[in-house]
Amino acid sequence: FNISGCSTKKLLWAYSTRSEEEFILFCDLPEPQKSHFCHRSQLSPTQVPDHLPFTDSKDLPDVQWYRQPSNGDPLEDIRKSYPHIIQDKCTLRFLTPGVNNTGSYICRPKMIKSPYDVACCVKMILEVKPQSNASCENSASHKQDLLLGSTGSISCPSLSCQSDAQSPEVTWYKNGKLLSMTRSNRIVVDEVYIYHQGTYVCDYTQSDTASSWTVRAVVQVRTIVGDTKLKPDILDPVESTLEVELGKPLTISCKARFGFERVFNPVMKWYIKDADLEWEVSVPEAKSIKSTLKDEIIERNIILEKVTQRDLRRTFVCFVQNSIGNTTQSVQLKEKRGSGGLNDIFEAQKIEWHETVRFQSHHHHHH
């Protein structure tokens, strides 16, 4: 097909000789083509397209990629001739860097539905060169890790040696989608979640007297986990006193948040203090009530069949521990004013002779 009508884009891949890195070309079909294939949804500048142009509609076919030999030979089908280049929907992925990737790459829809569609194509002139040794030593890696639950940032490798003030305007993409929120050479992440992982592309324009090039770099971002540096945090009970009715059953719940630990051995127990005595209570098994990638909330209850006068003189202590340290929360029972008649008190005193405590059993989940 005739490629003279294709829109043209010039890209530069300055690769690091010290690390493995990938490169991506998007089939960014042009506007204002009116054809079926080149249709762009009409978005205002403040709106962000869900995908790059053309790639979003389910009914549109994938694109075909070609490489144009420098000697004027016919276009080559990339899938047949270049095993290190992978066609993935509307993107072209270069798995290995090297100057042999320099050349012109053409993309167009696989199926042509009208004569106008012939010109619906993009020619990308890609220049590939090793990064000059003059580049700074601490340039950002093409593989960057973000620690879950913490703050972090993703730096554009080709601009990481420049200050934010010097940096040109940058266009970022994540997994092929335009990120309109930032134009700087760094994406700042206030709190890292698993959805932050993916393939990021950063583009900026470099101009000389003759022409203008888009300098592009690709960053693979992983979200990683690490052991907490905090001891567990007791969420409940919050208050150190609890109003109760004598002779009535009572459940006191202890809920604690445990930060992530690769080897997770949480300890959660109830014990009772009575004057100079202190003993651990046999209570139902702890159970996980909420588990996320960065922490887990565990609950363990102490159950009294009926509250006695003696219980009012005792302190109930929830003790939680991880490999970093322990936390405790004490609860003192206090009789509700105006509650409980003589019968209730009589019943409560009878129970003091037995001190029977009944428990339920729960399954305990952990990381």
Epitope: I194, T223, V225, K229, R262, V263, L293, S323
Partner: antibody
């Protein structure tokens, strides 16, 4: 660009303590786990243990009584000490970055960056 | 400790061949398995995690599959640089363990 380099004596006498250090360059020791692995001549790989940069450790039970792994974040280094060595401890010792990758509500741990290894011979 | 058994222990193949290496765990390990490649005198190189997720920069001719107790590493079309020893590794429970290795040689 993260690189690991093991250092330490290549020859240790029986019953003595083997001491190795791994220096991390081109990146921070923070946020990662760091493992030691060994490979006896002509044999497979054996995991010795790991340390998180904050100091949490986990050791292979078969070596636990003899192993200590420590970390010095200010020097970007972590170390291995193996006491009461015998000829059976002769091996190539590797240090590796041990990363926990979060993926779809779970975690997967891999040793994604390795040192080139250092040979330690236990002999009198 | 969970034992990983690789088969075969050694394998001869030619450039362009399709090769499959198997790793069997002594108990279920979900998808908590990684594959490594080691060349003589060199450190192991990480290829695959989560049983089937390819590390970026690893050629797409490598693929992993399996879950539970049975796993495979497949090289779709052997290249000269692929001749090496391959190890599987589980991290489902401690201690972390490796398979005994599969040596892939040129026929």
């Amino acid at each position: 660009q993260v690189q690991l380099q093991e250092s330490g004596p290549g020859l240790v006498k029986p019953s003595e303590t083997l001491s190795l250090t791994c220096t991390v360059s081109g990146g921070s020791i923070n946020n990662y786990y760091w493992s030691w692995i060994r490979q006896p001549p002509g044999k497979g790989l054996e995991w010795i243990g790991y340390i998180f940069y904050s100091g949490t450790t986990n050791y292979n039970p078969s070596l636990k009584s003899r192993v200590t792994i420590s970390v010095d974040t200010s020097k970007n280094q972590f170390s291995l000490k193996l006491s009461s060595v015998t000829a059976a401890d002769t091996a190539v010792y590797y240090c590796a970055r041990d990363v926990g990758i979060a993926a779809r509500n779970s975690y997967y741990y891999v040793m994604d960056v390795w040192g080139q290894g250092t040979t330690v011979t236990v002999s009198s | 400790a969970i034992q990983l058994t690789q088969s075969p222990s050694s394998l001869s193949a030619s450039v362009g061949d399709r090769v499959t290496i198997t790793c069997r765990a002594s108990q279920g390990i979900s998808s908590a398995l990684a594959w490594y490649q080691q060349k003589p005198g060199k450190a192991p190189k990480f290829l695959i995690y989560e049983a089937s997720s390819l590390e970026s920069g690893v050629p797409s001719r490598f693929s992993g599959s399996g879950s539970g107790t049975d796993f495979t590493l497949t090289i779709s079309s052997l290249q000269p640089e692929d001749f090496a020893t391959y190890y599987c590794q589980q991290f489902n429970s401690y201690p972390i363990t490796f398979g005994q290795g599969t040596r892939l040689e040129i026929k």
